[in-house]
Interface confidence: low
Amino acid sequence: TRDVREPPALKYGIVLDAGSSHTSMFIYKWPADKENDTGIVGQHSSCDVPGGGISSYADNPSGASQSLVGCLEQALQDVPKERHAGTPLYLGATAGMRLLNLTNPEASTSVLMAVTHTLTQYPFDFRGARILSGQEEGVFGWVTANYLLENFIKYGWVGRWFRPRKGTLGAMDLGGASTQITFETTSPAEDRASEVQLHLYGQHYRVYTHSFLCYGRDQVLQRLLASALQTHGFHPCWPRGFSTQVLLGDVYQSPCTMAQRPQNFNSSARVSLSGSSDPHLCRDLVSGLFSFSSCPFSRCSFNGVFQPPVAGNFVAFSAFFYTVDFLRTSMGLPVATLQQLEAAAVNVCNQTWAQLQARVPGQRARLADYCAGAMFVQQLLSRGYGFDERAFGGVIFQKKAADTAVGWALGYMLNLTNLIPADPPGLRKGTDFS
């Protein structure tokens, strides 16, 4: 006989990512004896909550909490029973709830209270439901991407930890209601609100981050819809042959479309709106979302927001990935350069509804919106953030890294459970139990 070393006990953590359009649950796991190592925490499982985001339940807070029950029941199965009590559970809400909190703080509080009430009924170590700031969302997304790609520290052949020379990756997140850009920068930020200083594994990082509220995919689509109603009476970004009834109350109920709201509109009126497959008018419509007129700093991205020049490589995830993946995979268009990305957007915007449906069979839900989405992504990256062809060459569009979804959730849990120490690791050798 010989001694067989048992694999170490695993620890688990759960994060509910309450986005504007939907909620996702992520369960993470890591070996209990390697808590301070990098690249050790990975995704164990995930679950998509049916229905809309929790902010869509402003009129029915208990409905928000009920929607989570199915995934929480799954968590009871996915996490071993003996680990339930020691498993931290967090809920973080992002821009959808930030918007609700702006327009209706009572409803936002009620939703969080209802959700909290439900989460405390479960045997996990519930550690709170809260709304993340845009800055937190950006920074935690950056931490996730760099942690998964082992850019902070790495375990070397000589049995010691070292900081890789390749530096960190910037992170770009396109959610439903906001978009975030975060990257390491050498110079101090002219706008202190955009700078975050982090100490991870004994290293100091100066990070620039900004979150643009109302620049998430869904809110952009609503704003373009409002603009189309206001200026054209047709939608240049929708395909010709596509027509739908638009309820004005839905278009103008978001704070993001408040500026375009007519003085005396009938919220219950339905307006028929048709597409015109016009890439040039669509580009103009999208351009209207960005303002470059004034900048109180030495340089800005758009809307008077300070941003240093983009530097280094970037990972673009969430709706950035879904948009580019649609162009690449569903439409078969090259998107390796900014020029190709623009050409791909124009290509989609030229398609009629019949052509689009024939080209992408079975994908009806958001098909009419891909032209606007692609045009927005292209303009946000080139005109908004200032990526030129060379810088764009360093952008990778990715959904997962190391079998784990890229997003703010993992970084949030790593931070709250102290799984990334501020101090450098000692000369400890890892043991592989695979």
């Epitope: 809309g52 409905g63 909490s65 009920q66 109920q253």
Partner: antibody, heavy 125, light 106 residues
Framework: EVQLQQFGAELVKPGASVKISCKAS????????MDWVKQSHGKSLEWIGD????????TYNQQFKGKATLTVDKSSSTAYMELRSLTSEDTAVYYC??????????????????WGAGTTVTVSS | QIVLTQSPAIMSASLGEEITLTCSAS?????IHWYQQKSGTSPTLLIY???NLASGVPSRFSGSGSGTFYSLTISSVEAEDAADYYC?????????FGGGTKLEIK
Amino acid sequence: EVQLQQFGAELVKPGASVKISCKASGYTFTDYNMDWVKQSHGKSLEWIGDINPKYDISTYNQQFKGKATLTVDKSSSTAYMELRSLTSEDTAVYYCARRGFFLYYGINYYYFDVWGAGTTVTVSS
Amino acid sequence: QIVLTQSPAIMSASLGEEITLTCSASSSVSYIHWYQQKSGTSPTLLIYSTSNLASGVPSRFSGSGSGTFYSLTISSVEAEDAADYYCHQWSSYPWTFGGGTKLEIK
């Protein structure tokens, strides 16, 4: 036919508690939230709270927290509201109402589509 | 909480007359519902989401409005319309009702 059956009247002493019922029929009880509404004599309506029968999750108007407790018995498709520490201010008609809804552009819209006949609670010594 | 103010509190109308009841909100709401309550009975849904007629409601009833101002119109009042009318908002927690308008038929 969708119906919510409530019983006529309750006479209770100050400081006591009362539990009123609302029996649902004609639809799947667990598919809809049940709300409770108070109407004092000659006055308007006040929303008390709601309960989701499927998961036993309730939400309350702050003004009624500690005053009302909502429960359900799924087996008999009945919703209950217990009112405690009663005073003359609690004398009113209490209605249960089914919460109907429709979904448009990802937003849930709600309204009370069916009401019970109401239970009159009189608090008097 | 959002306060809904209905006016007038009491309205007297002749048969066949067109009348408008109003509901004003202390802050902007997305939409409102109207309920009708006849003497000694429970309320019934009349109009949902500002302008949609509930099942079985006669077409003489109509609703409109946005933001902080909403109205309910009866194009030709009939005797059976004598009732209390309440507006109700779901835009902000806690959900609130207006004080009601009592419609009397002359």
